[in-house]
Interface confidence: medium
Amino acid sequence: AWELTILHTNDVHSRLEQTSEDSSKCVNASRCMGGVARLFTKVQQIRRAEPNVLLLDAGDQYQGTIWFTVYKGAEVAHFMNALRYDAMALGNHEFDNGVEGLIEPLLKEAKFPILSANIKAKGPLASQISGLYLPYKVLPVGDEVVGIVGYTSKETPFLSNPGTNLVFEDEITALQPEVDKLKTLNVNKIIALGHSGFEMDKLIAQKVRGVDVVVGGHSNTFLYTGNPPSKEVPAGKYPFIVTSDDGRKVPVVQAYAFGKYLGYLKIEFDERGNVISSHGNPILLNSSIPEDPSIKADINKWRIKLDNYSTQELGKTIVYLDGSSQSCRFRECNMGNLICDAMINNNLRHTDEMFWNHVSMCILNGGGIRSPIDERNNGTITWENLAAVLPFGGTFDLVQLKGSTLKKAFEHSVHRYGQSTGEFLQVGGIHVVYDLSRKPGDRVVKLDVLCTKCRVPSYDPLKMDEVYKVILPNFLANGGDGFQMIKDELLRHDSGDQDINVVSTYISKMKVIYPAVEGRIKFSTGSH
């Protein structure tokens, strides 16, 4: 028997520095977790103790903090090189700055293979990107070889900016021939490493013949055997065992997100490359693990230039940006409109001639808007200003919901109206009318939504049975502020870009902004 240790991360999302327990900015260092310096300590400890170790990343290193805003992926290449990753799969967020923003800082600089079998380049890009990412890689580990085959969510064109010269094929269809090829090369230990979410990971384990282990990402899935060490609730045991169609037991793993855990999986193979046993657990990277001093020093160097960024002008406002709780928790506020407009603008993807865009709607809990911005400071808007408005380090995500769920969400928005509670929704691409004289649960008297399958966008009544795409904060997607119906009834959830980054990019693009209160949210006569 031959034993392999797989160390894995996924959805790190620019958390190079240690973070608080909820993966936001570290405040009290003695309680902080994760970060590449701490990760390196643990990885080195395992490398010294065990003979056959692979360090893998399942995508979405890009996007999530000011590190990515400033360094645009160069920080990913640099620190992943320093940690000596063995391979990485491309995630959807690796395309956030277009193909060039992937090629230059990461693909050309990485000293490890970057993989995806289901992304095919065409046209002029094919020669430019040739060899910079691979469908698979055979890695020598000790006296053996291990094949790593990559995959990426086929939804990436809807979630990011890969352009028109990359085709995202069905994962299973694309993976099978690559695995077959590895088999003909006498590689009998094969790991599928990819970024399509836990449901697809399980399908790959079930359907792709020859895959021994699946290491996934995208869905931020936390798996654990035994008592979990922090706040995350396990979606299943680690590893999650799938019985394949040809009768093999295939372990599937994921390691939550944000570098909070290091996935740790030990696999035992027989001489024919069959998995005999698999066990392990994610390792919580808490403050009991010291930060490696040389990596920490490196982090501190890169930080020097970050601190200055926060105070630089992104653009100007010529109107007061009303982010006060007195407004945003009670009525339409122009800060809410600005943020929602930025959220939609960030998700413009012309992927189908029938649709002017794939999504037109935004909802945003008023309680998530934490500060106004005064235009009398020469109109200047800085990252620091936006961090006061959106201090929680969340993301603006894409979900699919039925009209009936949206209707419930808007009823919840005003179910206890008047108490300055955070669930009052700010909107974009939606016109809602409330009648507060009616009883809670029956106060939405009109709910019109902006069409997407149209050349001239217009507002149509919400259809209860139709499925709609909506951009919203991850806080709402996870059921925050009492929006349990969203969490329970959503049909799909893809995590998006860092909230401040979305708004800052929009302001930089617009240069001068003047959002108005324009009748997106109305109250029927006599009730308000």
Epitope: V70, K72, K108, I304, Q312
Partner: antibody, heavy 120, light 111 residues
Framework: QVQLVQSGAEVEKPGASVKVSCKAS????????ITWVRQAPGQGLEWMGD????????NYNEKFKTRVTITADKSTSTAYMELSSLRSEDTAVYYC???????????????WGQGTLVTV | EIVLTQSPATLSLSPGERATLSCRAS??????????MHWYQQKPGQAPRLLIY???NLESGIPPRFSGSGYGTDFTLTINNIESEDAAYYFC?????????FGQGTKVEIK
């Protein structure tokens, strides 16, 4: 090999602006900071500011903040430094320099342009 | 901002002698075992050239007679067995915090 090639000497009148270019080659332009340093005749070196071409992020010395603008064009791998409201004391050689990779030189300036003399 | 003071202003040596150049920072420029101090050489009519980075690391292509030392606020550039081609100005620079600043320079003359 790494090279930084600057534009030629300039003579400007007081109150005017000057824009100096710095074309980079031999490395990934977007992944390293470009710094601008000036040296008045017979004087020492003065750090003016820098730019990260990958994102366009800039830092400026407070002394020049209102007058200097540093930009970068990724498509041509060229950085620019524009200094406005020129006065006689701005007469100097203006250098662009590449900051080293953070694994090694750590913000030290490992490659320099040949310098551009600006006479006001 | 951090002010760097170099001494002496001028140093006149014969070939084969040792040059010791000093750079003092107005504030600690070291942290986590690293010192963010660098040394450059500049000859008349030329751009500066990096000699030493992070206080003591020799830049590639620089002769080993050049060395650097120091931690905190006091740093030294040493040139052993000085040669005529070493006649130049020498500048220290820190990169501990923004703005990065240079010392005023030391002129090294060879008799």
């Amino acid at each position: 090999q790494v090279q930084l090639v600057q534009s030629g000497a300039e003579v400007e009148k007081p109150g005017a602006s000057v824009k100096v270019s710095c074309k980079a080659s031999g490395y990934t332009f977007t992944s390293y900071w470009i710094t601008w340093v000036r040296q008045a005749p017979g004087q020492g070196l003065e750090w003016m500011g820098d730019i990260y071409p990958g994102s366009g992020n800039t830092n400026y010395n407070e002394k020049f903040k209102t007058r200097v603008t540093i930009t970068a064009d990724k498509s041509t791998s060229t950085a620019y430094m524009e200094l406005s409201s020129l006065r006689s004391e701005d007469t100097a050689v203006y250098y662009c320099a590449k900051e080293g990779g953070l694994t090694t030189e750590d913000y030290a300036l490992d490659y320099w342009g040949q310098g551009t003399l600006v006479t006001v | 901002e951090i002010v760097l003071t170099q001494s002496p202003a001028t140093l006149s040596l014969s070939p084969g002698e040792r040059a010791t150049l000093s750079c003092r920072a107005s504030k600690d420029v070291s942290t986590s075992g690293y010192s963010y101090m660098h040394w450059y050489q500049q000859k008349p009519g030329q751009a500066p050239r990096l000699l030493i980075y992070l206080a003591s690391n020799l830049e590639s292509g620089i002769p080993p007679r050049f060395s650097g030392s120091g931690y905190g606020t006091d740093f030294t550039l040493t040139i052993n067995n000085i040669e005529s081609e070493d006649a130049a100005y020498y500048f220290c620079q820190h990169s501990r915090e923004l703005p990065f600043t240079f010392g005023q320079g030391t002129k090294v003359e060879i008799k």
